[in-house]
Interface confidence: low
């Protein structure tokens, strides 16, 4: 991570920033992320991490913003519009939809701070909710009516 | 949230603590969490939030610790050992397992701070990784061998 100035007075800067820096961590699973032989395929593997064995498989897409804390976030991206057959691991079943599970994560953006009379006083951290997709889930489609 | 003292010098205390307080938010889905008529049942609903429409349905369990930031975390708990049939929404298919997706979230615990000569100086925040289950995912079982 690059080092940012903060609005927290200098003596507290490291504390505040260290806490922030580590307060969220990337989503990818705890299992060692072995390279998937078919990272982009709409199929459910019989080995590998959870996201490749799921019948609603997904990949993780890195979202990097050096003006945001955390700078690195990961978004799940579904590899199939529907769910994959448990039997074959490949055929899709349109009776099930592969839907993203979303989470509103708090992030902080660095913005210029302005002191008295609009003078630039380094950077402040601005809190924002940021929508992150955590995983893809096989669901029964909603019944309309 | 109750207000905690912090190790950040007093002028920076609010900043540091506010940032921390909001740096992670509970996981439950963005959709309004209407009470499920069968909250504990192993079935995939055709309406309601994602966790009840999933063929690997789950409920959220509150984990509250007033000495931790965030004080409230939610853990997913699978309602079925296997996946539910997309056709019926009820029968289980033993060809699929309902597995928890885990995430190592950083949390902060308040611990007594000790100043010079061991004198008590309020509370400090201690960073820890804390395992949280985000959702249940229908996966093909691992092939052993």
């Amino acid at each position: 991570y690059s080092h940012w100035p903060s609005c927290c007075p200098s003596k507290g800067q490291d504390t505040s920033e260290e806490l922030l820096r580590w307060s969220t961590v990337p989503v990818p699973p705890l299992e060692p992320a072995r390279p998937n032989r078919h990272p982009e395929s709409c199929r459910a593997s019989e080995d590998g991490p959870l996201n490749s064995r799921a019948i609603s498989p997904w990949r993780y897409e890195l979202d990097r913003d050096l003006n945001r804390l955390p700078q690195d976030l990961y978004h799940a991206r579904c590899l199939c519009p529907h769910c994959v057959s448990l039997q074959t691991g490949s055929h899709m079943d349109p009776r099930g939809n592969s839907e993203l599970l979303y989470h509103n994560q708090t992030v902080f953006y660095r913005r210029p701070c302005h002191g008295e009379k609009g003078t630039h006083k380094g950077y402040c951290l601005e809190r924002r909710l940021y929508r992150v997709s955590l995983a893809c889930v096989c669901v029964r489609p909603r019944v309309m009516g | 949230y109750s207000h905690w003292p912090s190790c950040c010098p007093s002028k920076g205390q609010d900043t540091s603590e506010e940032l921390l307080r909001w740096s992670t938010v509970p996981v439950p889905p963005l959709e309004p969490a209407r009470p499920n008529r069968h909250p504990e049942s192993c079935r995939a609903s055709e309406d309601g939030p994602l966790n009840s429409r999933a063929i690997s349905p789950w409920r959220y369990e509150l984990d509250r610790d007033l000495n931790r930031l965030p004080q409230d975390l939610y853990h997913a708990r699978c309602l079925c050992p296997h996946c539910v049939s997309l056709q019926t929404g009820s029968h289980m298919d033993p060809r699929g397992n309902s597995e928890l997706l885990y995430h190592n979230q950083t949390v902060f615990y308040r611990r007594p701070c000790h100043g010079e000569k061991g004198t008590h100086k309020g509370y400090c925040l201690e960073r820890r990784l804390y395992r949280v289950s985000l959702a249940c995912v229908c996966v093909r079982p691992r092939v052993m061998g």
């Epitope: 448990l86 039997q87 055929h91 079943d93 349109p94 009776r95 | 997309l86 019926t88 029968h91």
Partner: antibody, heavy 121, light 107 residues
């Protein structure tokens, strides 16, 4: 031997309701969904909906605008179709049909009842 | 709703002929298609499920093929007992829908 036996022919006035029964035997009634299909004279088959006897879960064809209600009596291994606000165009043969499936690839109506003729006039 | 269109609406062929009936879906349905046979005055019977799988007891002269939006039912050598109306049906999404039927007669 799998058998689906439907109730007898009905003659109804417009605006009335009709309830058709379908008694199943020769298989585990709760293990298969039951479909209802209509065939108006000289017309194509028209799917009305299905019910899962295991939990009462239903899926309806919205083209019937909420006039259809599907129910089951698992203790009697019988499925029921009720159609309300009858009109002349509802005249036709109503079939119950068991749906076989493998959970993931095929869903097919493998056994059909003999049909119930409903006349609205 | 997914519209299913069969062609031809009716056809006449001789015993021993190879007969082909097509079914077209208004949108892609993968292989989620069944074929039914309905003889005059009788109940529909399942013939082929999942595009190409023959239902038990169905003669091997019947076969099915296709994927996506275009499907075919073929009778390799027409027999007198094959006189019937044939319907395709999609189960890709609710509501299930049937084709308008193809009436097959013997010349």
């Amino acid at each position: 031997e799998v058998q689906l036996v439907e109730s007898g022919a009905e003659v109804k006035k417009p605006g009335a309701s009709v309830k058709v029964s379908c008694k199943a035997s020769g298989y585990s009634f709760s293990g298969y969904t039951m479909n209802w299909v209509r065939q108006a004279p000289g017309q194509r088959l028209e799917w009305m909906g299905l019910i899962n006897p295991y939990n009462g879960g239903t899926s309806y064809n919205q083209n019937f605008k909420g006039r259809v209600t599907l129910t089951v009596d698992t203790s009697a291994s019988t499925a029921y179709l009720e159609l309300n606000s009858l009109r002349s165009e509802d005249t036709g043969v109503y079939y119950c049909a068991r749906e076989d499936f493998d959970s993931w690839t095929f869903f097919a109506m493998d056994y059909w009842g003999q049909g119930t003729l409903v006349t609205v006039s | 709703d997914i519209q299913m269109t069969q062609s031809p609406s009716s056809l006449s062929a001789s015993v021993g002929d190879r007969v082909t009936i097509t079914c077209s879906a208004s949108q892609g349905i993968a292989s989620f298609l069944n074929w039914y046979q309905q003889k005059p005055g009788k109940v529909p019977k399942l013939l082929i499920y999942y595009t190409s799988s023959l239902h038990s007891g169905v003669p091997s002269r019947f076969s099915g093929s296709g994927s996506g939006t275009d499907f075919t039912l073929t009778i390799s050598s027409l027999q007198p007992e094959d006189v019937a109306t044939y319907y395709c049906q999609q189960y890709s999404s609710f509501p299930y829908t049937f084709g308008q039927g193809t009436k097959l007669e013997i010349k």
